[in-house]
């Protein structure tokens, strides 16, 4: 597989119509949450939360500030942190709690706190809950979270020093967390989390699962330097912890290595940057797209690999485990475990088979199963990408975030369109055409070439947008700039599945944005402009 060529078209910031939102003296617009039914985009920034019109983000609807008291700032500074940059409240969690409220957490000058934001009054309820384990202390530390049925699942660091990683569920009746142990989480950098719902008519009566994606330091590969490994981990929503062993800890936490490499060249992409779960009516199981860079990235390489969720499920449900063994007194080696596996299977969700055997909850699981999963959280089998190779490899660029849209071209062909942002404020649009990936467009979203920190895709029919957050603000861009292609040739050569040439109006129009019939429109994804 060759490196993806340079983008066919580059739009400079001033050349295209981009809608922007930023407020004076407000920075770090890194938390974005879209409410499609309300046509509202919620933005979490440093010491502030905004609600803006999702169709035109320059229209601010509401704002609320959550500042740190001078006393808190002083205490934070006493501990050696910067009063100007670190001892502030960076909003890190912005999750829907109900139709009328959001759950918001911030670093709060190294004393993480959470609150409920009433969407009607757009005021905080003043709950001031302890945010430890839900939100990082340090704005520089990694974090991820997802709200599942009113309970927050988070991956972050639990302590001030940032040395104690945790994947937890914040729940009034059944809070759970990972063991604080190196084999469970080894200096992870959390990237993404999401829930995958089991279909209601699932024959095995299986549980919903929450997946976590992170990069961590390998325990299984021994080199002179620290080897980073991308991981996919999962827990079961119904997990209630163990009765004695793993009390208030996950009994279903398992993790596996994500493979993204180019075998022919020995290129290994082992630092996970972002993940997007693609759900589509045409997909039986979700596909997740993961964005990677190599560990030693002096040439600016980035790659995208796509994975079937069923491949990951297979590893967790039927794969072999890894075991830590001691050699020469106390030296550790990780090897494939070939011994007997207890029943019920360690780390498995409670399904109808388990229930039939009278294991109705993780609290009923036998000690053997619990002890095994406590000692064997790592799978020996790896999760391999679709087609066993990356979808995209790009040189001289550091990609930061990814979103993917599945769209249908005029001829009925379905394309997965990848929107990938860079550390220089650009957005690349890439698709697979004739077994090769083409970057059909590059748009400079941010004038100051700053890294894109967050990328969000609207899924509502009609007005479709990509939203990008950076340190200085948020930018809203349409999925395509069809109108910029002034001739039929340009429109066809763009090879953009969202665009087609309309001979009656002599314009390049956006498909799926109008209800008008597509008869007579010209689109040739092969780029053959002779049809014009």
């Amino acid at each position: 597989m060759a490196f993806a060529p340079i983008p066919r078209i580059t739009w400079e910031h001033r050349e295209v119509h981009l809608v922007q939102f930023h407020e004076p003296d407000i920075y770090n617009y890194s938390a974005l949450l879209l409410s499609e039914d309300k046509d509202t985009l919620y933005i979490g920034a440093r010491e502030a939360v905004f609600a803006v019109n999702a169709l035109n983000i320059s229209e601010k609807q509401h704002e609320v500030y959550w500042k740190v008291s001078e006393d808190k700032k002083a205490k934070c500074a006493e501990k050696g942190k910067s009063k100007q940059t670190e001892c502030l409240n960076y909003i890190r969690v912005l999750q829907p709690l109900s139709a009328t409220s959001l759950y918001v957490c911030g670093t709060n000058a190294f004393q993480p706190a959470c609150d409920h934001l009433n969407l009607t009054s757009f005021k905080f309820l003043g709950k001031n809950e302890d945010g430890k384990g839900r939100c990082p202390f340090d704005p520089a530390h990694s974090y991820t979270s997802v709200m599942v049925d009113g309970e927050l699942y988070s991956g972050t660091s639990y302590n001030f020093l940032g040395s104690e990683p945790i994947i937890s569920r914040n729940s009034s009746h059944s809070p759970l967390r990972t063991e604080y142990a190196i084999p469970w989480l080894n200096e992870p950098s959390f990237v993404f989390a999401d829930v995958i719902r089991k279909s209601p008519d699932s024959p095995d009566g299986e549980d919903d699962r929450v997946y976590f994606f992170f990069t961590e330091v390998s325990v299984e590969y021994e080199f002179v330097f620290r080897v980073l490994i991308p991981r996919i981990a999962r827990v079961c929503k119904g997990d209630q912890g163990g009765l004695r062993t793993l009390q208030k800890k996950w009994t279903s936490f398992l993790k596996a290595r994500l493979i993204c490499s180019r075998p022919d060249s020995g290129l290994v992409f082992n630092v996970l940057r972002d993940v997007f779960v693609l759900r589509s009516p045409g997909l039986k199981v979700p596909v997740f797209y993961a964005l990677f860079t190599p560990q030693l990235n002096n040439v600016g390489l980035s790659a995208v690999c796509a994975y079937n969720l069923s491949t990951a499920e297979e590893v967790f449900s039927h794969g072999k485990y890894m075991q830590s063994t001691t050699v020469e007194q106390s030296h550790t080696k990780w090897v494939r475990y070939n011994g007997p596996v207890p029943k019920p299977r360690p780390g498995a969700c409670i399904d109808s088979e388990a229930r039939a055997a009278n294991y109705t909850s993780s609290l009923n699981l036998p000690d053997k199963t619990l002890q095994f999963v406590k000692d064997h959280p790592l799978m020996d089998d790896s999760v391999t990408p679709i087609d066993n190779r990356p979808r995209l490899i790009k040189k001289d660029v550091n990609y930061t975030q990814i979103v993917v849209d599945r769209t249908q071209a005029l001829d009925g062909t379905v394309y997965d369109v990848m929107f990938v942002s860079t550390d220089r404020g650009a957005l690349h649009k890439a698709i697979s055409l004739e077994h090769a990936v083409h970057i059909i467009e590059e748009t400079q979203l941010f004038q100051d070439f700053e890294p894109v920190q967050t990328l969000l895709l609207s899924s509502k029919k009609g007005n479709r947008f990509v939203y990008a957050g950076s340190n200085s603000g948020v930018v809203q861009a349409p999925l395509a700039f069809c109108g910029k292609h002034g001739t039929c040739e340009d429109c066809v050569l763009a090879r953009d599945p969202y665009c087609a040439w309309s001979p009656p109006t002599a314009t390049c129009v956006a498909l799926h944005q109008t209800e008008s019939p597509s008869r007579g429109l010209i689109q040739e994804m092969s780029g053959d402009a002779s049809v014009c």
Epitope: Y158, N159, F160, E164, R177, I182, E187, S330
Partner: antibody, heavy 118, light 111 residues
Framework: QVQLVQSGAEVKKPGSSVKVSCKAS????????MHWVRQAPGQGLEWMGQ????????SYNQKFKGKATITVDKSTSTAYMELSSLRSEDTAVYYC???????????WGQGTTVTVSS | DIVMTQSPDSLAVSLGERATINCKAS??????????MNWYQQKPGQPPKLLIY???NLESGVPDRFSGSGSGTDFTLTISSLQAEDVAVYYC?????????FGQGTKLEIK
């Protein structure tokens, strides 16, 4: 059995440095964090810092930043703590301790006495 | 930092009698229903030895005359029937928040 064996007592001059070792045996060294705790004569216990043996990532009590440097040698399953710019108030017994899953120090070294005297 | 204050500083109890040591934290050491409070015993010239972890769990090999209780900010170590070998200094320690901190110690003697 699980054991932590520390290096012997040291007498040092003010301004000098000392490196205390802690050799682990009887368990997977890489699976557990190693911590250091000090006890000044007739005083209580003070947590100094910790290290992750697989990564060498250390974190410190703010009070001991710049004073203590914690390292590991995985090949010999040994943790080290170096104390620099020694002063008389650094005279103490220094312990290494394994930090167990339940967030407690379940195994301790026998202690190394460091005496700083001119 | 969380300050741990033990009381009393020293305690003299007759053999066979109950000994109680208290420990108060300057803020809660609980997280999601777990109390991250540990108790250690230290005899002269020896390193500390773990007795109780997570407020009330007895470390294996420790006699069951030792027990721990409490949550939030107030914790207690109880020796139900004092034995001669229990003469030592006892420390409480919180591991909920770094820097991990110890109490000043309680010296237990025989009356």
């Amino acid at each position: 059995q699980v054991q932590l064996v520390q290096s012997g007592a040291e007498v040092k001059k003010p301004g000098s440095s000392v490196k205390v070792s802690c050799k682990a045996s009887g368990y997977s060294f890489s699976d557990y964090y190693m911590h250091w705790v000090r006890q000044a004569p007739g005083q209580g216990l003070e947590w100094m810092g910790q290290i992750n043996p697989t990564t060498g990532g250390a974190s410190y009590n703010q009070k001991f930043k710049g004073k203590a440097t914690i390292t590991v040698d995985k090949s010999t399953s040994t943790a080290y703590m170096e104390l620099s710019s020694l002063r008389s108030e650094d005279t103490a017994v220094y312990y290494c301790a394994r930090y167990y899953y339940g967030r407690h120090f379940d195994v301790w070294g026998q202690g190394t006495t460091v005496t700083v005297s001119s | 930092d969380i300050v741990m204050t033990q009381s009393p500083d020293s305690l003299a109890v007759s053999l066979g009698e109950r000994a109680t040591i208290n420990c108060k934290a300057s803020q809660s050491v609980d997280y999601d229903g777990d109390s991250y409070m540990n108790w250690y015993q230290q005899k002269p010239g020896q390193p500390p030895k773990l007795l109780i972890y997570a407020a009330s769990n007895l470390e294996s090999g420790v006699p069951d005359r030792f027990s721990g209780s409490g949550s939030g900010t107030d914790f207690t170590l109880t020796i139900s029937s004092l034995q001669a070998e229990d003469v030592a200094v006892y420390y409480c320690q919180q591991s909920n928040e770094d820097p991990y901190t110890f109490g000043q110690g309680t010296k237990l003697e025989i009356k």
